[in-house]
């Protein structure tokens, strides 16, 4: 899909197994033709997407594309949810799908989970 | 063009274990999630679970949780799917199929591979 | 799970004829997105199926405009306006909404 529109890629119905303690950067890649969009996340509550206000976000440049990050540090079991990224431009609002983190809360390192395992986890909403 | 091309048949005993590839091509796969899909002799399509290979999540359906594994490597664009614990009713040919994560603009089927699981 | 329910499961139809198929859903496949994640299949035989329609009524690249896709909700529908001598196969609906992803069983269409 080739456009001058902003563009956010993050996949549909994308999911992350992260554990409770550790960083963790959740990426929102965004493609734009000249002046960068203000970007912003925010979590799902039921339908409604409350932004995140004070959390730690920063901007990676590459040659393609950017990625406006928000970063877990650590990351807390109550972060356990779905997320969604947008962008303003042109008094335009674009949303992204929303992509979804699973925290397992910390264990030793020979009983972490694997992706198998989370994705088989009977708490997962869907 | 998006291209699958999978690995040819299998014949395995019961109780033994079977691991089908699927290289894709036309297509970076960490934009993608990957599945597989069986279709036993004469019956209807039966999905068995998918990857995002970005990062290698995996989804399962519950018949095939614990005894499908599927795996990706993004350095040569193969998608991995191995059964465990084979029986004659898992006989079937097994498709990969890739789709377009972002606005599932494209849905691209392998060629099969027929598994055949016969004492 | 979701169950996806098809008919008929056979349909006669004579070459330049109208096909209908049915597909229902046990549960709205409406997803939060606003989005329907309903997609048709067409399988001959020997072949890997091959997607007809997706979200609903979309074609893919390539697809005949003779099929048509539509519905919301619980109810959807594959129409072929003229069969052509090459439209005989099988056709399967199937759900992208929920996890597991579910197919329909399958509505094979055969010349009368």
């Known amino acids: 899909k080739e456009s001058c529109d902003v563009q956010l890629y993050i996949k549909r119905q994308s999911e992350h197994s992260i554990l409770a303690g550790d960083p963790f950067e959740l990426e929102c890649p965004v493609k734009y033709c000249a002046n960068r969009p203000h970007v912003t996340w925010c979590k799902l509550n039921g339908t409604t997407c409350v932004k995140l206000e004070d959390r730690q976000t920063s901007w990676k440049e590459e040659k393609n594309i950017s990625f406006f990050i928000l970063h877990f540090e650590p990351v807390l079991p109550n972060d356990n949810g779905s997320y969604r990224c947008s962008a303003n431009f042109q008094s335009n609002l674009i949303e992204s799908h929303s992509t979804t983190l699973y925290v397992t809360d910390v264990k030793s390192a020979s009983e972490r989970p694997s992706k198998d395992e989370m994705a088989s986890r009977p708490w997962l909403l869907y | 063009q998006v291209q699958l091309v999978q690995s040819g048949a299998e014949v395995k005993k019961p109780g033994a274990s079977v691991k089908v590839s699927c290289k894709a091509s036309?297509?970076?796969?960490?934009?993608?999630?990957m599945y597989w899909v069986r279709q036993a002799p004469g019956q209807g399509l039966e999905w068995i679970g998918r990857i995002d290979p970005a990062n290698g999540y995996t989804r399962y359906a519950q018949k095939f949780q614990g005894r499908a594994t599927i795996t990706a490597d993004t350095s040569t664009s193969t998608v991995y799917m191995e059964l465990s614990s084979l029986r004659s009713e898992d006989t079937a040919v097994y498709y990969c199929?890739?789709?377009?994560?972002?606005?599932?603009?494209?849905?691209?089927w392998g060629q099969g591979t027929l598994v055949t699981v016969s004492s | 799970e979701i169950v996806l329910t098809q008919s008929p499961g056979t349909l006669s139809v004579s070459p330049g004829e109208r096909a209908t198929i049915s597909c229902r859903s046990s549960?709205?496949?409406?997803?939060?997105?606003?989005?329907?994640?309903l997609n048709w299949l067409q399988q001959k035989p020997g072949q890997a199926p091959r997607r007809l329609i997706y979200?609903?009524?979309k074609r893919d690249t390539g697809v005949p405009d003779r099929f048509s896709g539509s519905g919301s909700g619980t109810d959807f529908t594959l129409t072929i306006s003229r069969v052509e001598p090459e439209d005989f196969a099988v056709y399967y609906c199937?759900?992208?909404?929920?996890?597991?992803?579910?197919f329909g069983q399958g509505t094979k269409l055969e010349i009368k």
């Open positions: 549960q709205s496949l409406l997803d939060s997105d606003g989005k329907t994640y």
């Open positions: 199937w759900q992208g909404t929920l996890f597991p992803r579910t």
């Open positions: 979200l609903v009524s």
């Open positions: 199929a890739v789709y377009d994560g972002y606005y599932e603009s494209f849905d691209v």
């Open positions: 036309g297509v970076n796969i960490k934009d993608t999630y």
